[in-house]
């Protein structure tokens, strides 16, 4: 087949036609439609929305749209036995109770089925004891407490502020420290930007607002009862005691009004330094326990949530490719929300909906993409990326053979300052080239490209004149595709100015105040940032699905591999004596990176020169590009994390949201000076260098001439 046979529109107009069809007004309309009631995973409302999306995607013109259901472990509060935290006096009387629900936002007072704030998958329990304030509950915060301040959290209830790291890591750290309960709260220092009013008058978190969220440590497992396999009708399910990643101690989230009541009475040690102080009018004493007058008072948690196997529904839409129908480009984002989902996820789902509509319009005019595009509306992302992971587990054999790329589409905005992109290095050039062709929506950049405003506002720390592109971590639905299956992945959204707004995420994240009005009044009244994100996400999908040669540049991987090798080497070199004693060498890794660089360079030269009219050679070169990401997968996975199999990138062991490079080596080196058996510890470092070097070399060889 001729390479243009996929379309009846001249190739250079394809992308333009697609982009021109995207309309801000439609995204606005879709967002409104998706946010009028809650769409909690496992509820009838979210099933109805799945069926609505299925119906609309069919109307838009997709070839097929199916629901894929799974029965997974979810978690809900007990409707008749609410969760709360008390301060109790010496007689056991409750003298203060945290609130049972958030004050409903204006206009939503009569909406039913708003799930009250809770920590999903918390076990039941009513622990009582003294409180210890543990800052953000990061690894380094517990090091400070235990090693420097000699404060023992064993048998204590800890209170931690949200932010900096994934909440599941906080809970894991608290468990390891021996705590018997965890209270999570949003401090105004992290969730209240100065000079901005609280919702409903602005985009800041009010004192009664609370962040919901799961507290699992799944490490990529998906449904806790069926790790590695789909939670289908004939699934074998583990017992709850063997479930993956469940917390073992009660956990509950509160807002800063309630946190004030708990923290204002804290006694014991003063905070170690100013980084432990938030913005409440409290001393931020660490404890344990309350100060003098209140020393006989204790904190008691009342947690009655239940874990239930519940049916969830993904929507999977297919637009069949005309030339390479067995090559899949996937655009996926989740549909389930904690409450209204004004930003998370529906600002993303509305963009996906408009992208599907635009592709459908082109298809109705006779166009088809070269490769198959799959569109996904994932369920139960908020409960641990469950919908996407179960679908990928069910379809893993197809995906590992046919998956070209995955583009994630959760929240389109977390601010309105500039673009934010996290992706595989293979996509750097695609993103650069695409954003140079798109108009910037930013004030002061009229008539300028998105690339220009993005580069100005978020410059690369390494390369002048280029924008920052970050590593993929986790905490979203690309995880299974990238970290487990090795499918090239990327994500894009509009973000805040990290320089001036140092709060974590956006203030109303996972609260009842994430409404349509939040977006329409305060973040993006014209929906111009949503439109830009639609153009970036949709443009990436278009290019990945339609370009004759896959728009991947393997040379960019070579550059970052060298950077990551330098970084991990410098970490190791903080222990020069031990490296000498245990004969630790990075030579093999640097050699492999050098080989990769040379082979990638030669491959790129061949890519420029080969005969693109020869479909066999074209397919061969494209397959080498497609399978390069796959080549970084170690089938054995990372130590104790079998579903994190990518050797170059994994979610940080200390923060699921963050990406770590050469994670196997990094984790082997982490806190190595405290290991009881240094010989064994440095032996593991050497083994991880070996695995990394082998993997880089093996990946390089996939780019060599095939014969």
């Amino acid at each position: 087949k001729s390479s243009n046979e996929a379309t009846n529109i001249t190739p250079k107009h394809n992308m333009k036609a697609f982009l021109d069809e995207l309309k801000a007004e439609n995204i606005k309309k879709f967002l409104y439609n998706f946010t009028q009631i809650p769409h909690l995973a496992g509820t009838e409302q979210n099933f109805q929305l799945a069926k609505q999306i299925q119906s609309q995607w069919k109307e838009f013109g997709l070839d097929s749209v199916e629901l894929a259901h799974y029965d997974v472990l979810l978690s809900y509060p007990n409707k008749t036995h609410p969760n709360y935290i008390s301060i109790i006096n010496e007689d056991g009387n409750e003298i203060f109770n945290t609130s049972l629900f958030e004050p409903p936002p204006p206009g939503y007072e009569n909406v039913s089925d708003i799930v009250p704030p809770f920590s999903a998958f918390s076990p039941q329990g009513m622990p009582e004891g003294d409180l210890v304030y543990v800052n953000y509950a990061r690894t380094e915060d517990f090091f400070k407490l235990e090693r420097d301040m000699k404060i023992n959290c064993s048998g204590k209830i800890v209170i931690a502020r949200y932010g900096k790291v994934f909440r599941g890591n906080k809970v894991k750290n608290a468990q390891l420290a021996g705590a018997k309960g965890v209270i999570l709260y949003s401090d105004p220092a992290d969730y209240f930007a100065p000079g901005v009013k609280s919702y409903p008058d602005g985009w800041n978190l009010p004192g009664g607002g609370v962040q919901r969220g799961n507290i699992l440590n799944l490490n990529g497992a998906g449904d806790p009862l069926t790790p590695g396999y789909p939670a289908n009708e004939y699934a074998y399910r583990r017992g709850i005691a063997e479930a993956v990643g469940l917390p073992s101690i009660p956990v509950h989230p509160i807002g800063y009004y309630d946190a004030q009541k708990l923290l204002e009475k804290m006694g014991g040690s003063a905070p170690p330094d100013s980084s432990w102080r938030g913005s409440l009018k409290v001393p931020y004493n660490v404890g344990p326990g309350f100060t003098g007058n209140f020393s006989t008072q204790k904190v008691k948690m009342h947690i009655h949530s239940t874990n239930e196997v519940t049916r969830i529904y993904n929507v999977i839409g297919t637009l069949r490719g005309a030339v390479e129908p067995d090559r899949y480009v996937i655009l996926g984002g989740h549909r389930d929300s904690w409450v209204f989902g004004g930003i998370d996820p529906q600002s993303g789902a509305a963009v996906v909906h408009e992208i599907v509509r635009s592709f459908g319009t082109l298809k109705k005019e006779g166009w088809r993409p070269r490769r198959t595009i799959l569109f996904a509306s994932w369920d139960a992302e908020e409960f641990g990326l469950l919908g996407s992971t179960e679908w990928a587990e069910e379809n893993s054999r197809l995906l590992q053979e046919r998956g070209v790329a995955y583009i994630n589409a959760d929240s389109s905005i977390e601010g309105n300052y500039t673009l934010r992109v996290d992706c595989t290095p293979l996509m750097y050039s695609l993103v650069h080239n695409l954003t140079k062709e798109l108009k910037s929506p930013d004030e002061g950049f009229e008539g300028k490209s998105l690339y220009e405003s993005w580069t100005k506002k978020s410059p690369s720390p390494e390369f002048s004149g280029m924008p920052r592109i970050s590593k993929l971590g986790s905490g979203n639905d690309f995880e299974v595709f990238f970290q487990r299956l090795g499918i090239a992945s990327g994500r894009a959204r509009y973000t805040k100015n990290w320089e001036t707004n140092k709060f974590s995420g956006y203030p109303l994240y996972h609260s009842v105040y994430e409404t349509y009005e939040l977006v329409e009044k305060f973040y993006d009244p014209m929906f111009k940032y949503h439109l830009t994100v639609a153009q970036v996400r949709g443009g990436m999908v278009f290019e990945l699905a339609n370009s004759i040669v896959l728009p991947f540049d393997c040379r960019d991987y070579a550059v970052v591999l060298r950077k990551y090798a330098d970084k991990i080497y410098s970490i190791s070199m903080k222990h020069p004596q031990e490296m000498k004693t245990y004969s630790v060498s990075f030579d093999s890794l640097f050699s492999a990176v050098k080989n990769f660089t040379e082979i990638a360079s030669k491959f790129s030269e061949r890519l420029q020169d080969f005969d693109k009219s020869n479909p066999i050679v074209l397919r061969m070169m494209n397959d080498q590009l497609m399978f390069l990401e796959r080549a970084f997968i170690d089938p054995l996975g990372l130590p104790d994390r079998p579903f994190y199999r990518h050797v170059i990138y994994a979610p940080s062991s200390h923060n699921k949201y963050a990406g770590e490079s050469f994670p196997g080596i990094y984790d082997a080196l982490f806190d190595i000076e405290s290991k009881v058996d240094p010989s064994k510890a440095w032996g593991e470092v050497k083994r991880q260098i070996y695995v990394a070097a082998f993997t880089v070399q093996a990946a390089a060889e996939t780019l060599s001439e095939v014969a």
């Epitope: 709360y84 203060f96 109770n97 945290t98 609130s99 049972l100 629900f101 958030e102 004050p103 409903p104 204006p106 206009g107 007072e109 009569n110 009010p206 004192g207 009664g208 607002g209 807002g255 009004y257």
Partner: antibody, heavy 122, light 111 residues
Framework: EVQLVESGGGVVQPGRSLRLSCAAS????????MHWVRQVPGKGLEWVAV????????YYADSVKGRFTISRDNSKNTLYLQMNSLRTEDTAVYYC???????????????WGRGTLVTVSS | QSVLTQPPSVSGAPGQRVTISCTGS?????????VHWYQQLPGTAPKLLIY???NRPSGVPDRFSGSRSGTSASLAITGLQADDEADYYC???????????FGGGTKLTVL
């Protein structure tokens, strides 16, 4: 305009019970803590009780503790005060008042009803 | 006997400035609890005049101002007008009583 309207006052004998209601004309009722404050005619104000917006916390003045119960029904935008074992010294105009901060108990009163007179007399 | 002490009455001629004091103790105002002020015109319900020591709700003229220092607070009224004639109450929180406390009220007479 936002309004609070008390009802249920009247003459009652000592030892008997009475239930006061306070109807709010706004949907945002469910986001505010609510108080009862009383005033003996010609005298000063005395705070009686408060309930948080969600009912999770209720606090009482020592003079009424164990006898009075404050409650609310957010679906009806209504606040209640159940008064048992009434005494002659409970005679007063009873005002319902809204707490000054949405979603919190800041313990001041930014909106008052007109009051309902309770007379405890044999 | 009220927990917060106010003068029973104050007076002033139209246009003058008057202040009403409110004295507490280390368990209320002195414990850094906020002070609020209410105006009660004859035959009506009280109305919030000053909240959190020195803030005026919308609609309250800037002739009214509040301050707090140590264990006491005060309300100042400048440019006295005839319709300012009313009872004025201060209010705070007391951590010994674990409850809201009021002053006994001050009757302002405009001469």
């Amino acid at each position: 305009e936002v309004q609070l309207v008390e009802s249920g006052g009247g003459v009652v004998q000592p030892g008997r019970s009475l239930r006061l209601s306070c109807a709010a004309s706004v949907r945002t009722f469910s986001g505010y803590g609510m108080h009862w404050v009383r005033q003996v005619p010609g005298k000063g104000l005395e705070w009686v009780a408060v309930i948080s917006y969600d009912g999770s916390n209720r606090y009482y003045a020592d003079s009424v503790k164990g006898r009075f119960t404050i409650s609310r029904d957010n679906s009806k935008n209504t606040l209640y005060l159940q008064m048992n074992s009434l005494r002659t010294e409970d005679t007063a105009v009873y005002y319902c008042a809204r707490d000054g901060n949405w979603g919190s108990l800041d313990l001041y009163f930014d909106l008052w009803g007109r009051g309902t007179l309770v007379t405890v007399s044999s | 006997q009220s927990v917060l002490t106010q003068p029973p009455s104050v007076s002033g001629a139209p246009g003058q400035r008057v202040t009403i004091s409110c004295t507490g103790s280390s368990s209320n105002i002195g414990a850094d609890y906020d002070v609020h002020w209410y105006q009660q015109l004859p035959g009506t319900a009280p109305k919030l005049l000053i909240y959190v020591n020195n803030n005026r709700p919308s609609g309250v003229p800037d002739r009214f101002s509040g301050s707090r220092s140590g264990t006491s607070a005060s309300l100042a009224i400048t440019g006295l007008q005839a319709d300012d004639e009313a009872d004025y109450y201060c209010q705070s929180y007391d951590n010994t009583l674990s409850g809201v406390v009021f002053g006994g009220g001050t009757k302002l007479t405009v001469l």
